[in-house]
Interface confidence: medium
């Protein structure tokens, strides 16, 4: 996983990573949907 997020606590880091993972999944689905629609 990426280390590129500033944080001062591991729990905050973990939460930011979870958000990042979620956004990647959502954006990935949207991209796949757009390709499908084409």
């Amino acid at each position: 996983h990426s280390d590129g997020i500033f944080t001062d606590s591991y729990s905050r880091y973990r939460k930011q990573m979870a958000v990042k993972k979620y956004l990647a999944a959502v954006l990935g689905k949207r991209y796949k949907q757009r390709v499908k629609n084409k």
Epitope: D3, G4, S9, S11, R14, K15, A18
Partner: antibody, heavy 121, light 111 residues
Framework: EVQLVESGGGLVKPGGSLRLSCAAS????????MSWVRQAPGKGLEWVAT????????WYPDSVKGRFTISRDNAKNSLYLQMNSLRAEDTAVYYC??????????????WGQGTTVTVSS | DIVLTQSPDSLAVSLGERATINCKAS??????????MTWYQQKPGQPPKLLIY???NLDSGIPDRFSGSGSGTDFTLTISSLQAEDVAVYYC?????????FGGGTKVEIK
Amino acid sequence: EVQLVESGGGLVKPGGSLRLSCAASGFAFNNYDMSWVRQAPGKGLEWVATITGGGSYTWYPDSVKGRFTISRDNAKNSLYLQMNSLRAEDTAVYYCARLTGYDQAGAMDYWGQGTTVTVSS
Amino acid sequence: DIVLTQSPDSLAVSLGERATINCKASQSVDYDGDSYMTWYQQKPGQPPKLLIYAASNLDSGIPDRFSGSGSGTDFTLTISSLQAEDVAVYYCQQSNEDPWTFGGGTKVEIK
């Protein structure tokens, strides 16, 4: 097979320094966050330090902050703990542990056998 | 810091009987629907061994007589049918807030 082997423990005088090492094998070391956990004789477990897979971020409890430094060399599959200004209360078995990949839950799924640090004059 | 209080300190259970260990946190260890509570088993002279993560998920290779439950501040580790090899000290650990903290341990013995 995942293996973690600690070394570098020993007897040191109060105020002295020691560097612990942990050799990792059997997994993609750079993909995992790693920790050090210690256990004083006859006592429970205490978290000492954590480092991210790429080594960019580190965390410590107040009890060791400013005295201990966790680091890693991913090219050598090795984890380190530099311990300075050692105190009698730092006497413990020090374990190297791998964090699970489960959404950074903080659980540690593989542990080494530990290395003993004794701080005494 | 989040303080984890385990009870009882020690427990003697007959072979085949149920063993229940409690872990109470001084504040919630939940975040976004997940509980950041872990359970470990430690036998004499050995390092801790991961049993359960995220309060109720059994780690791979752990017998299903072990189970975890709870959320918020109250958690339980249950051994449904105690076996001789389960004699050990059991620790809970939270990782929702820094610093990560462990409970004081519960020693499980055979009655």
